[in-house]
Amino acid sequence: RSLQDTEEKSRSFSASQADPLSDPDQMNEDKRHSQGTFTSDYSKYLDSRRAQDFVQWLMNTKRNRNNIAKRHDEFERHAEGTFTSDVSSYLEGQAAKEFIAWLVKGRGRRDFPEEVAIVEELGRRHADGSFSDEMNTILDNLAARDFINWLIQTKITDRK
């Protein structure tokens, strides 16, 4: 029934790596709550999850595009139009190297969400799927945020 039933490990790994707000100890939780900090902790946790979840959702959606009949609603129905929105259409004509340069200069960071731009671009590169596999492996071992920073800071030519 749900798109969420694939790619579980990379999502949960990313969430754990990015979240410094662990509260395994009930007594510590009580103490923090009495100081008025508890409620904001969960809000902060959700803040840290939001961008990463979106990256993972995009990856899952792209992976499931082959199964169009089964997953039609998930990527075809957006209120704004289709899944390929302004971000993807903008990136359509960008070569990977040009895109990274554009992103590093800061325009991409201001105009478009980093996670959308990166996933859209990576999903487009290498028809044989090898780059996608590489990206999946990386995401399995890095928090999404760390991966994004790493990608922005590393020249495409250095990685190929």
Partner: antibody
């Protein structure tokens, strides 16, 4: 298919304790955050508690803080809610809910177990 | 916490007609980084748990009939059932998942 089955509900006196369980199947339990959500006639649906996939993060709604403890046993695919110092306001149907890939979004729910706190 | 307010509390619509339920949040649930509204709709039938219909304000969960649609942004949202079927009789709840999750009080949908 995904299944969540709660148990442990019942009638209990104010001040007493109860432990709810939720047996999960049909998905990789150890990869998902889990929640308890309750539904009382007066209050409607109310989020109660969350535990991350590995149990390292636990959060609670203010009204149960210090009284309820959420936990999980990934080896048994089971979620728990230990409820202490129960009051009449805790009377509700308690649902366990699986978090989707998006935080705090509930894509699967159990059938619920009724907890009645009454003297 | 973000307060969710639904209207109306109850609604009676003829079979085949359009049903519209509104939901208002006390603060915006739009995440500017991805332009998504963190708003979900659930359906709850008698003696059953809630069932996820729509998330991100407008995306239908898999298996949900296309007569269900969601719209809105920021603080004002709408769930629309384009042609009411008998099996749609239920309570409907909105929920924000932008922050600590909170639900609307529910709307009871009946057949006129």
């Amino acid at each position: 298919q995904v299944q969540l089955v709660e148990s442990g509900g019942g009638v209990v006196q104010p001040g007493r304790s109860l432990r709810l369980s939720c047996a999960a199947s049909g998905f990789t339990f150890s990869s998902y955050g889990m929640h308890w959500v309750r539904q009382a006639p007066v209050k409607g649906l109310e989020w109660v508690a969350f535990i991350s996939f590995d149990g390292s993060n636990k959060y609670y709604t203010d009204s149960v803080k210090g009284r309820f403890t959420i936990s999980r046993d990934n080896s048994k695919n089971t979620l728990y809610l230990q409820m202490n110092s129960l009051t009449a306001e805790d009377t509700a149907i308690y649902y366990c809910a699986k978090e989707s890939i998006l935080a705090a979004l509930f894509d699967y729910w159990g059938q619920g177990t009724l907890v009645t706190v009454s003297s | 916490d973000i307060v969710m307010t639904q209207s109306p509390d109850s609604l009676a619509v003829s079979l085949g007609e359009r049903a519209t339920i509104n939901c208002k949040s006390s603060q915006s649930v739009l995440y500017s980084s991805n332009n998504k509204n963190y708003l979900a709709w659930y359906q709850q039938k008698p003696r059953q748990p809630p069932n996820l219909l729509i998330y991100w304000a407008s995306i239908r969960e898999s298996g949900v009939p296309d007569r269900f649609s969601g719209s809105g942004s920021g603080t004002d949202f709408t769930l629309t059932i384009s042609s009411l079927q008998a099996e749609d009789v239920a309570f409907y709840y909105c929920q924000q998942f932008y922050s600590i999750p909170t639900f609307g009080q529910g709307t009871k949908l009946e057949i006129k």
